[in-house]
């Protein structure tokens, strides 16, 4: 567990020509607030997908009134940090969306109105416990400068906030087998967890997730004895000239794996695949609980509060195995059609399509613009073998033959009313909702669901999206 912290340093016009008009005026004073949305992994989902790592809303900044004729300066910002608590491990790679919202405070019927001024997004690598990282992002003519960091909440420590520290049991030293935590010398580190299945007799580790073998043993889990003979086949060659003895039964005969483990022969010995809750060379060791941290790669451990009840690891996308120790190679199933390139991003699959093909799995064959007419003043746009019709306002469909009614799909959520507009559509939200599609509920106490609305609104305040 821990907290992602975001500090906004400035929001104002970016460098270069075309400085944006001030968002506030003497007639319509306004103030800014910010929303951050975090997702695990290097995600490429749309802005509307859930903020799986969490989201937060800033306080509202000071009221700002434009000075007539003056260029838009850096706008006054809310005080304090935006903090996004995370309950599980910090993923190390994450995607963010930071939105700058404007709250207009003019004499409007029904109270203030909100509109989205700018949205920036990015993908970053970040270790928990590290220093503040500085960033600059541009959205149109606006520029946002900010810093961010992830920090662990005690008792968690480490770059992923997965190691646990406990207060010392005695003032003089940590208990037997426990050492002080590096950043917190007055606390003690909880026991280390090696790679799942690492032999408790022949393997050891000094870093989480590793498995080093004692002399005489080998294999990823130190379950294979090192052979001293020169025999190369599993049972040894039958030729007497090699000087190798040929053992009779195979290593899996009689199934040496206890507790329902299944045996498979290896070049020198055997390996047991153990059921959940057992490990060791012959699956002889039981008593693993969630307290032992058996789930790797950010897996969530459920059950197993005592040694007699089995635990279950709920693996994040891209991992499998009883301890989430195996990375799933979903590209081996060749899901991308028509020669598309498969990218396994861990949290999701992506297909990079060859020119002339499109769709999530490159399943759509696109023609080019040759001999193709787009109706009602639409223009055919060609790009690397693909085509599409860019339709004039008020028309849609593959060939721009359909008259477009932007409100036909009922895009306004929660009872919002839709109005067709020359530039698209406008949603007039029902009381208690805000956002481009009335998708954000506003709660009376200022708290809000994710994504959230600005604090301090009363339930009866009608919301307008400008």
């Amino acid at each position: 567990a821990g907290v992602f912290e975001l500090q906004i340093h400035s929001f104002g016009p970016g460098p270069g020509p075309g400085a944006p008009r001030s968002p506030c005026s003497a007639r319509l004073p306004c103030r800014l607030f910010f929303r951050v949305c975090l997702k695990p992994g290097l995600s490429e989902e749309a802005a509307e997908s859930p903020c799986a790592l969490g989201a937060a809303l800033s306080a509202r900044g000071p009221v700002y009134t434009e000075q007539p004729g003056a260029p838009a300066p850096d706008l006054p910002l809310p005080d304090g940090l935006l903090q996004v608590p995370f309950r599980d491990a910090w993923p190390g790679t994450f995607s963010f969306i930071i939105e700058t919202w404007r709250e207009e405070l003019g004499d409007q019927i029904g109270g203030p109105a909100w509109s989205l001024l700018a949205r920036v997004a990015g993908r970053r690598r970040l270790a928990a416990g590290g220093p503040w990282a500085r960033d600059i992002q541009r959205a149109g003519a606006w520029e946002l400068r900010f810093s961010y960091r992830a920090r662990c909440e005690p008792p968690a420590v480490g770059t992923a906030c997965t190691r646990l520290c406990r207060p010392r049991s005695a003032p003089s030293r940590c208990g037997p087998g426990l050492r002080p935590c590096a950043p917190l010398e007055d606390e003690c580190e909880a026991p280390l967890v090696c790679r799942a299945g690492c032999s408790p007799e022949h393997g050891f580790c000094e870093q989480p997730g590793e498995c080093r073998c004692l002399e005489g043993w080998t294999g990823p889990l130190c379950t294979v004895p090192v052979s001293t003979s020169s025999c190369l086949s599993p049972r040894g060659p039958s030729s007497a000239t090699t000087g190798c003895l040929v053992p009779g039964p195979g290593p899996c005969d009689g199934n040496p794996c206890a507790n329902g483990g299944s045996c498979s022969e290896t070049p020198r010995s055997f390996e047991c695949t153990c059921p959940r809750g057992f490990y060791g060379l012959r699956c002889e060791v039981s008593g693993v609980t969630c307290a032992d941290g058996p789930c790797f790669n950010g897996g969530l451990c459920v059950g197993g509060a005592d040694p007699d009840s089995a635990y279950i690891c709920h693996c994040p996308p891209g991992f499998q195995g009883s301890n989430c120790e195996k990375r799933v190679d979903r590209c081996s199933l060749q899901p991308c059609r028509n020669g598309g390139l498969c990218l396994d991003l861990g949290h999701a699959l992506r297909c990079r399509c060859r020119a002339g093909f499109a769709g999530p799995r490159c399943e759509h064959d696109l023609d080019d613009c040759a001999g193709r007419a787009c109706a009602n003043g639409g223009t055919c746009v060609e790009g690397g073998g693909a085509h599409r019709c860019s339709c004039a306002l008020g028309f849609g469909g593959r060939d721009c033959r359909e008259r477009a009614d932007p409100c036909a799909a009922r895009p306004c959520a929660h009872g919002g009313r839709c109005y067709a507009h020359f530039s698209g559509l406008v949603c007039a939200c029902a009381p208690g909702y805000m956002g481009a599609r009335c998708e954000f509920p506003v709660h009376p106490d200022g708290a809000s669901a994710l994504p959230a609305a600005p604090p301090g609104l009363r339930p009866g305040d009608p919301q307008r999206y400008l």
Epitope: G175, P176, G177, L178, R179, P191, L192, V193, C194, C198, S199, P200, E201, H202, G203, F204, C205, E206, C211, L214, C222, G280, L281, E284, V285, G287, D292, P307
Partner: nanobody, 127 residues
């Protein structure tokens, strides 16, 4: 709670022998490592020998290889350390340690591996 009780320490001349015992009266350790550690005044704790209960692995520090032997009698809930050809540098407080549940964290001669310890027995070797 798991208790470990060491005995067998004492004073001996260089070249002599001692046999240390570590008994667990309250708990039968069916699998996992048990080890012997020692600490001389002003020095770091040092792993001496370890044995895997329920397996066949024994490990020794280089300084005692060929002179010390670790063994276990599970029926008696006891682990032994037979120390032969003792040297003055073997003088120290000797501690017995056990894993309550076996796991692979840390080398068997690393004290961090163990979560139960005895109170120790003193060994003094004079020249």
């Amino acid at each position: 709670d798991v208790q470990l009780v060491e005995s067998g320490g004492g004073s001996v001349q260089a070249g002599g022998s001692l046999k240390l015992s570590c008994k667990s009266p309250t708990y039968t350790i069916s699998s996992g490592y048990m080890g012997w550690f020692r600490q001389a005044p002003g020095k770091e704790r040092e792993g001496v020998a370890a044995i895997y209960i329920g397996g066949s692995t024994t490990l020794y520090a280089d300084s005692v290889k060929g002179r010390f032997t670790i063994s276990a009698d599970n029926a008696e809930k006891t682990v032994y350390l037979q120390m032969n050809t003792l040297k003055p540098e073997d003088s120290a407080m000797y501690y017995c340690a056990a894993q309550l549940r076996p796991n692979s964290a840390y080398h068997p001669l690393d004290g961090r591996k163990y979560n139960y310890w005895g109170q120790g027995t003193q060994v003094t070797v004079s020249s």
